[in-house]
C-alpha cells in the first residue's frame, strides 16, 4: 500500500489521542533506555510503511502484536485515513486471526513495541517531504 | 561486532539476472536492522538498491524497483539480491550493508560483478 | 528526485591542513545527512549521521554542520589516514535515497 495520499494530521491526533496511551501501557514495567532503536524512517509515508508491516507482520521471535489494542486502533486509524487501506487489508486481516491467542507479552515482544514507539516519534517529528 | 561478506557469480551475461549473497556473522539479521545492497559502478558513486528490514519489509530504489527482489534466510543469517534483465549499465561493485533504513552503518568489501557475453 | 552536488570535486591539501568539503542538496532536506569515506579498494565508512552526529569510533577531528541544503564535513587537521574519497547522502527522500558524486581529498 502506498500512504503518501494519508491525511497525516488526523492519524496523527489518534496516535496522540489513543495508540499512543495503549503502546505506552503494552511497554509498562521497562524503561526507555531497555532497547536500543535500531530502524528508523525517513518521511510519513515510510514510517507508516514500516509501522504497519512492524505491526501486522508476525515475525518468530513475536508473533501476537496483531491482537493488541494499540495494533487494533492502528488499523482502525489506517482504513479511516488513508484511502482504500482497508481494501489491501485482507491478508492482513487472516495473519490478525492465524496470531497466536496468548496474551504472554514477551521480551521480543516488548522490543518490536519499542521500535513501533520509535517509528511513531519520528512520523510525528518528520515534515512531509513527499507529497 | 557484524560483519558482512557478499558472494557470488562475477561475470553475468547480458538480459540474464544477477544474484548475490550477503552473510551476516556477529549479529542475527531477525534481531533488529535493515540489510540493503549499495552499488557502485567502476570509477563512479555509489547508489543505493533497496532493503529488507528485520521484520521482513522490504523498499527499493524506483529506478530499479521493477527489476530487483531483496530476501533473506534467517536460518543461515543472509539476505539474498536478485536482479533481473542485466545489461552493461549494471556492472559494478555491489555492497551489502547494515542499514537504520536511512543511512549505513556497516559495509561488506564488495563484489565485483561484470556483465559482458 | 533530489540531487546531491559535492565540491569540490578534488581537494589538494597537506597533512596537517583543514580541510572543508560542501555539500549542497537540489531541495531541504532537514539534518537528514550522511558523510562516508571511502579508500581505495575498500568499502565506505560512516563517519558522520543527522548532519553533526560522530558515528561510533570516529575521531574528534570529523565534524559535520548544515541543515537543510547546504551542508559541510569538516577535517580539523589532516592524518594522512584521511587521504581518500568522501561521499554525503541524503536520507529525506525516502525511497529516493541518494549519494553526492564525491570529493576526492589528496595529498598536495
Known amino acids: 500500500y502506498d500512504f503518501t495520499n494519508c491525511d497525516f494530521q488526523k492519524i496523527e491526533a489518534d496516535y496522540l489521542r489513543t495508540i499512543s496511551k495503549d503502546l505506552i501501557t503494552y511497554m509498562s514495567g521497562t524503561k526507555s533506555t531497555d532497547f536500543n532503536n535500531t530502524v528508523s524512517c525517513s518521511n510519513r509515508p515510510h514510517c507508516l510503511t514500516e509501522i504497519q508491516s512492524l505491526t501486522f507482520n508476525p515475525t518468530p521471535r513475536c508473533a501476537s502484536l496483531a491482537k493488541e489494542m494499540f495494533a487494533r486502533k492502528t488499523k482502525a486509524t489506517l482504513a479511516l485515513w488513508c484511502p482504500g487501506y482497508s481494501e489491501t487489508q485482507i491478508n492482513a486481516t487472516q495473519a490478525m486471526k492465524k496470531a497466536r491467542k496468548s496474551k504472554v507479552t514477551t521480551n521480543k515482544c516488548l522490543e518490536q513495541v519499542s521500535q513501533l514507539l520509535g517509528l511513531w516519534r519520528r512520523f510525528i517529528r518528520t515534515l512531509l517531504k513527499k507529497q | 561486532q557484524v560483519q558482512l561478506q557478499e558472494s557470488g557469480p562475477g561475470l553475468v551475461k547480458p538480459s540474464e539476472t544477477l544474484s548475490l549473497t550477503c552473510a551476516v556473522s556477529?549479529?542475527?539479521?531477525?534481531?533488529?536492522?535493515?540489510w540493503s545492497w549499495i552499488r557502485q559502478p567502476p570509477g563512479k558513486g555509489l547508489e543505493w538498491i533497496g532493503y529488507i528490514s528485520y521484520y521482513g519489509s522490504t523498499s527499493y530504489n524506483p529506478s530499479l524497483k521493477s527489476r530487483v527482489t531483496i530476501s533473506r534466510d534467517t536460518s543461515k543469517n543472509q539476505f539474498s539480491l536478485k536482479l533481473s534483465s542485466v545489461t552493461a549499465a549494471d556492472t559494478a561493485v555491489y555492497y551489502c550493508?547494515?542499514?537504520?533504513?536511512?543511512?549505513?552503518?556497516?559495509w561488506g568489501q564488495g563484489t565485483l560483478v561484470t556483465v559482458s557475453s | 528526485e533530489i540531487v546531491m552536488t559535492q565540491s569540490p570535486a578534488t581537494l589538494s591539501l597537506s597533512p596537517g591542513e583543514r580541510a572543508t568539503l560542501s555539500c549542497r542538496a537540489s531541495?531541504?532536506?532537514?539534518?537528514?545527512l550522511a558523510w562516508y569515506q571511502q579508500k581505495p579498494g575498500q568499502a565506505p565508512r560512516l563517519l558522520i549521521y543527522?548532519?553533526?552526529s560522530r558515528a561510533t569510533g570516529i575521531p574528534a577531528r570529523f565534524s559535520g554542520s548544515g541543515s537543510g541544503t547546504d551542508f559541510t564535513l569538516t577535517i580539523s587537521s589532516l592524518e594522512p589516514e584521511d587521504f581518500a574519497v568522501y561521499y554525503c547522502?541524503?536520507?529525506?527522500?525516502?525511497?529516493?535515497?541518494?549519494f553526492g558524486q564525491g570529493t576526492k581529498v589528496e595529498i598536495k
Open positions: 547522502q541524503q536520507y529525506s527522500d525516502w525511497p529516493e535515497y541518494s
Open positions: 531541495q531541504s532536506v532537514s539534518n537528514n
Open positions: 550493508a547494515r542499514t537504520n533504513l536511512l543511512y549505513f552503518d556497516s
Open positions: 556477529g549479529y542475527s539479521i531477525s534481531s533488529g536492522y535493515g
Open positions: 543527522d548532519a553533526s
